[in-house]
Every structure is written in C-alpha cells, then in structure tokens.
C-alpha cells in the first residue's frame, strides 16, 4: 500500500500505525482499532475511520427539498463492524445484542432489533445532499465562483471524480452541495461519495483526518468561506424501512 | 543484528501478577510493532497483544484484554507484559515478537503457575 | 475474529518428497498470511511473508502462494532438518490470529 516511504506516514489518514514491515519492506499504515492496512493514496473507508475514532485514546426555490426517504446521522457515534473490504456489514449489533441495519454510509435504516434481525444486502447510499449555512459576510458569494471552488474542493482534496459532484445549489446563507453515485457509476478506485462526505464532515468540524495538512481553508475569490452548520442528508437506492411509530 | 531478548523464567502463585519483558537491540524500537504470544506445552500458539513503542498505541484479544496489560520503555528499548491473576491455565512459553509478519522472536519466557 | 484452518494435522513424509501445506483464511485476508517453522523447544522462525515473498536466510526449497482465502506453502524436496511444525499466521486485521499447525513427519 502506497504510503509516504522517506518517513513513513499515511497523508490521507492520520487515525493510522505506519511501519516499514508492509510487502516488500514497505511502509505499511494500519487504521487503529481494526488494524486494517489501508490504502494512502487514496480516502480511507467512513467505516474504518469510524473504528478508530471510537479506540482512539477517544418558492423558485433552488434548494433542494430532501424527500421523505431522506436519512440523518441522528444516531451518532458506534464502534462499527467492518468487511475485509473496509465496508459497512449491513447489520450492526452493540455490545447489548441491539442489532440494526444500515447503509453503506453506515447510517441506521431499520427499527433496532434483537439479534434475530436480518438484513439481506448492504443497500448503497446513491445520493448525498450536504446542507451548509455560512457565517455572515459583506455580500452573497457570486454563484458560479462558489460552485467552482467547492467542485474544485472535492476533485482535490477529497480526489472526488467530477461527474459524482451533481450539483452546488446556493441561497445565501445555505449552500447545499448534492454529490450522487450509483452503483453501476462506480468503478473500481472510484472514491466513494460516502466517504468523501464523511471527510469534508469531518474538515469542515475542524477535525480534519489528513495528516499534517492544515484544516480546510475554503476561499471564493479570496474571501472566507467559514461553515457555522452541517446538515448531511442520506438517500438510498432501496427507501428505508421504519415502523409507522417512528414517523410520528 | 536485530535481537529480541527475553527475561528469565518465572515460577508465581495463583494470583499473583508476574511482569515479562523484552528488550530489543539492533534496529530502531519505535517504528515496528512488538507482539507477545503465548504457547502452552504441545499446543498452538496464540497471539495476545500488540504494541506500537512511538505511540504506545496498544491492541489486545479479547481473550487476554482484562489481565494483560502491554508497555514499554523507549529510553531502554524493552517492551513488557504484566499478567495480573495468572491461573495455571496460564503456565506456557510466552514468546515477544517483532513486525506484522513476526520476523524475529525472543527466545521465550516459561511462566509457571503453581501454588 | 479471523479463522485459520490448516490441513492435513499431520504428514508423512520421506526425505526427498515434495510436498504442500494448505491454509484457508475465514475470510480474505488479501496476501497478508505469514508462514512459520518450529521445532521442539524452539522459538518459531519465519519462512515466507506476504503470503509469497522469500525471506533472507530461508532455503529456496520453501515456497508460498494464494491470495484471498487459500493458501499453499510448499517444500520442494523435503530434508531432515524440515521435519516439525509448521503454522500460518494472518495480519491482516486485530486480532491476529495463527492456525492450529500441520505437524511435518517423517514416514
């Protein structure tokens, strides 16, 4: 696995062990907590990222309305079970026998059950609407400038494949960025929107994973782009199945 | 060359808690993993742990995570293992080893449990 | 955890045969899989990583392949001096874990 050889470091994930005994005598990075060797060249998995966090030493509207399928991460932080491939397993359980299901973002998409609860496939989160409010500034940032720069953003910092950005909706002072992947889009060493989500998440809390790097100084031609709220809204190929109790 | 030398053997009481070490020479001690593993006579071996000596980031089975406890001592290049409430089902060899894939071996330290 | 299933337990052999150890990981484990020798009261020693790769020092009599889930280690032309124990090890996620070893005989 790629990793900074002179010292031995993984660039994209600082929640990582490197040493010089990978294949070949390289420099092998694990994530902590699963001790999975990952890939620095490119994101590690959200669910990877997870584990570790959790052992770390711890009108003409042009907004989207999200429709009624749409998931949030209300649940927050779990120690996540992981495939060797770094994915979400389709259920998760805690320590208690409480089992689940979730998406490929690893957001909860069933009722809580017991460990009797089945879920059949690991169902791909398709499409991703980032819903951001900016700090006040003098004036509205211009439209095509912003959209730019957060394309930009995502193409290189997060190594996003352009055409997965859909669309950069802005009415200030919300920004909704919509990032969507189908399966049979996503080829092999594509990043995954859900990761990549998770990462820009995680940058704009000012708890970037990258290692090293300064945290995420966004600018539209010049001026600060500072995010005072995140909202992250999850839609899947197949709608979530909750109890009628839970919807009201 | 690289050398993982082990501390004497050790006869303890049930209960009682023993410290094994393990003092490594001949390469740098912060940038590679010590494992310690476990053999009882005849068997298999087992692995109990793992540490990293730059962070002392520290991995264990869940078999041994209550009363194995892994550290080290940069300045001296030895790693350690305290077993606390040993029971004769912990009487084996108990080996530390260094890397992922577990290039070099201590020569092994014989615990026995035994009132 | 990660299972490792290592077969046959025990094998018979006659110094000058060839012969393969199998090792089938619970789940793929890529080519993180180690092999390793022991004799009576003997630390153990490596002899191939990475599934496939030599280490310095080992005959070249000894040879290791697969990827995934199933893997070969191989002694081309077996010696006296080959005979004990032989046990895979995966590192390709915490916790480690070994097989339970194929004891190498002499028939």
């Known amino acids: 696995h790629t990793a900074a050889q002179d010292n031995c470091t993984c660039p994209t994930n600082k929640m990582t062990v490197c040493s010089p005994d990978g294949p070949g005598g390289r420099c092998q990075c694990r994530a902590l907590g699963s001790g999975v060797a990952v890939d620095c060249s490119t994101l590690t998995s959200k669910c990877l990222l997870l584990k570790a966090r959790m052992s770390a030493p711890k009108n003409a509207r042009t907004l989207v309305r999200p429709n009624e399928h749409a998931l949030v991460d209300n649940d927050g932080l779990y120690d996540p079970d992981c495939d060797p491939e770094g994915r979400f397993k389709a259920r998760q359980c805690n320590q208690t026998s409480v089992c689940w299901c979730v998406n490929s973002v690893g957001v909860r998409r069933t009722d809580k059950g017991d460990l009797s609860l089945r879920c059949d496939e690991l169902v791909r989160t398709h499409h991703i609407l980032i819903d951001l409010r900016h700090r006040p500034t003098a004036g509205a940032f211009n439209h095509s400038d912003l959209d730019a720069e957060l394309r930009r953003l995502f193409r290189e910092r997060y190594r996003l494949h352009p055409k997965f950005v859909a669309a950069v909706h802005y009415e200030q002072p919300t920004i909704q960025i919509e990032l969507r992947q189908n399966t049979s889009q996503k080829a092999a060493g594509d990043v995954d929107i859900g990761d990549a989500a998770y990462y820009f998440e995680r940058d704009v809390k000012g708890e970037s994973l990258f290692q090293g790097r300064g945290g995420l100084d966004l600018r539209v031609r010049g001026e600060p782009l500072q995010v005072e709220r995140t909202l992250i809204y999850y839609l899947d190929e197949i709608p979530p199945k909750f109890s009628m109790k839970r919807l009201t | 060359q690289v050398q993982l030398q082990q501390s004497g053997a050790e006869l303890v009481r049930p209960g009682a808690s023993v410290k094994l070490s393990c003092k490594a020479s001949g390469y740098t001690f912060t940038s590679y993993w010590i494992n310690w593993v476990k053999q009882r006579p005849g068997q298999g071996l087992e692995w109990i742990g793992n540490?990293?000596?730059?962070?002392?980031?520290?991995n264990y089975n869940q078999k041994f995570k209550d009363r194995a406890t892994l550290t080290v001592d940069k300045s001296s290049s030895t790693a350690f293992m305290q077993l606390s409430s040993p029971t004769s089902e912990d009487s084996a060899i108990y080996f530390c080893t260094r890397g992922s894939g577990f290039d070099y071996w201590g020569q092994g330290t014989t615990l026995t449990v035994s009132s | 955890d990660i299972v490792l299933t290592q077969s046959p337990a025990t094998l018979s052999v006659t110094p000058g045969d060839s012969v393969s150890l199998s090792c089938r990981a619970s789940q793929s484990i890529s080519n993180n899989l180690h092999w390793y020798q022991q004799k009576s009261h003997e630390s153990p020693r490596l002899l191939i990583k990475y599934a496939s790769q030599s280490i310095s020092g080992i005959p070249s009599r000894f040879s290791g392949s697969g990827s995934g889930t199933d893997f070969t280690l191989s002694i081309n032309s077996v010696e006296t001096e080959d005979f004990g124990m032989y046990f895979c090890?995966?590192?390709?996620?915490?916790?480690?874990?070994f097989g339970s070893g194929t004891k190498l005989e002499i028939k």
């Open positions: 090890q995966q590192s390709n996620s915490w916790p480690f874990t």
């Open positions: 540490i990293f000596p730059s962070g002392s980031y520290t």
